[in-house]
């Protein structure tokens, strides 16, 4: 049997026998274009493609549409994998989305959606989510039905206020919605009463800015 040399996601890498967490090269579906991603091979059975990570505020997340489309940051630290890759990937097969959150008091929580995909750029990478379970709130902190993605230079939200500018970062803002994991990073003791922080309302409330977040995807049939 010929060994697979290109991988669409971290689940394929895991299944090939490479089961150590770290940076791997993935290939766009139906293309030779490559992208580097962090693969979490430890959490919940492994095979997770990390699409977003925040941990220390070292990377500026107030970026342009193009940067959110193509990705930015470092897969070893804070980064955004890229809307285009995620859209293409999740348009091919059914994926689940796991969101892991940490607060400043040492607590952790997660939200798991049993079906996640991003529409194409022509639909502003609108998010689609169903089937929420987990410990980070019984109600989805990503507005349902899903919103279009907005950035500081591409305002697709439902507010006259330009949510991305007011709340910082690119996100699926509604008007402006109960979450924003790409908001301004605030250190401990400065992380409360912040409209524009890293927010997951149905876990920590409106003004609380989180310490760390990870968004990761995996095929539903893994």
């Amino acid at each position: 049997k010929e060994e697979q040399t290109t991988f669409r996601d971290c689940a394929e890498i895991f299944k090939s026998g490479l089961t150590t967490s770290g940076i791997y090269t993935l290939t766009f579906p139906n293309s030779t274009e490559e992208i580097k991603a962090y693969c979490d091979m430890d959490v919940g059975g492994g095979g997770w493609t990390v699409i977003q990570h925040r941990e220390d505020g070292s990377v500026d997340f107030q970026r342009t549409w193009k940067e959110y489309k193509e990705g930015f940051g470092s897969p070893l630290g804070e980064y955004w994998l890229g809307n285009e890759f995620v859209s293409q990937l999740t348009g091919q097969h059914r994926y689940v989305l796991k969101i892991q959150l940490k607060d400043w008091e040492g607590n952790e929580a997660h939200s798991l959606y049993d079906h996640f995909y991003l529409a194409g750029e022509e639909s502003n990478y609108r998010i689609h989510l169903t089937g929420l379970t987990g410990t980070a709130g019984k109600i989805s902190s990503i507005s349902q039905p899903g919103s279009d993605f907005s950035t500081k230079d591409s305002d697709n939200d439902k507010c006259i206020c330009k949510c991305s500018q007011m709340l910082s970062g690119g996100w699926w803002f509604d008007a402006c919605g109960p979450s924003n994991l790409n908001g301004q990073y605030y250190p401990q003791k400065q992380n409360t009463n912040k409209f524009n922080g890293i927010k997951w309302y149905y876990w920590k409330g409106s003004g609380y800015s989180l310490k760390a977040t990870t968004m990761m995807i995996r095929p539903a049939d893994f």
């Epitope: 006259i160 206020c161 509604d174 008007a175 109960p178 409209f195 409106s206």
Partner: antibody, heavy 123, light 112 residues
Framework: QVQLVQSGAEVKKPGSSVKVSCKAS????????ISWVRQAPGQGLEWMGR????????NYAQKFQGRVTITADKSTSTAYMELSSLRSEDTAVYYC????????????????WGQGTTVTVSS | DIVMTQSPLSLPVTPGEPASISCRSS???????????LDWYLQKPGQSPQLLIY???NRASGVPDRFSGSGSGTDFTLKISRVEAEDVGVYYC?????????FGGGTKVEIK
Amino acid sequence: QVQLVQSGAEVKKPGSSVKVSCKASGGTFSSYAISWVRQAPGQGLEWMGRIIPILGIANYAQKFQGRVTITADKSTSTAYMELSSLRSEDTAVYYCARPYYDFWSGPGGMDVWGQGTTVTVSS
Amino acid sequence: DIVMTQSPLSLPVTPGEPASISCRSSQSLLHSNGYNYLDWYLQKPGQSPQLLIYLGSNRASGVPDRFSGSGSGTDFTLKISRVEAEDVGVYYCMQALQTPLTFGGGTKVEIK
């Protein structure tokens, strides 16, 4: 386009209560804080309180605490403001208003207003 | 509570001339996101208030560009570059940083 339509004018006796309704149409209701603002004849605008329908939580200006109750019915997208122990000084136009962003994003200034409900308190 | 103070109380204006209204808050309305949570409203005679300027300096939809908002922290100004007859009414500033939301006392703009 969101619209807020309020109930009609009321004439009330001192000591009684009044309940004014505000029906939202043409947009999301539950996640926006509906505020009530009043204006006595020839006077300025005064914020009374607000409700967040999705949470069922209301908060009030200190001045009206204990005398005003703001509620909401999500099924009909209607907010209500009830003011009790009415006195002549409560004669005013009462407005409901909706902010330009949802409650998750801050208290918010108002970009959609009802047409106003005149409440006259007279013996 | 944040106290909002407006001046002048009354402003007689000549059509075509500029006009300026001042608003002061008892504490800063500048949030850490860089926005000032200060709105301006116009209430025309017999009408509900309408939003003119939001978050300090942003014109609401359909508001003519002769209206502009400026200022930061505790001192804010609404300017009308060339007053028109339809601009008459009472102008209010309002802080939207925290509840209770509080309004300035209003400035009545009338044609001379």
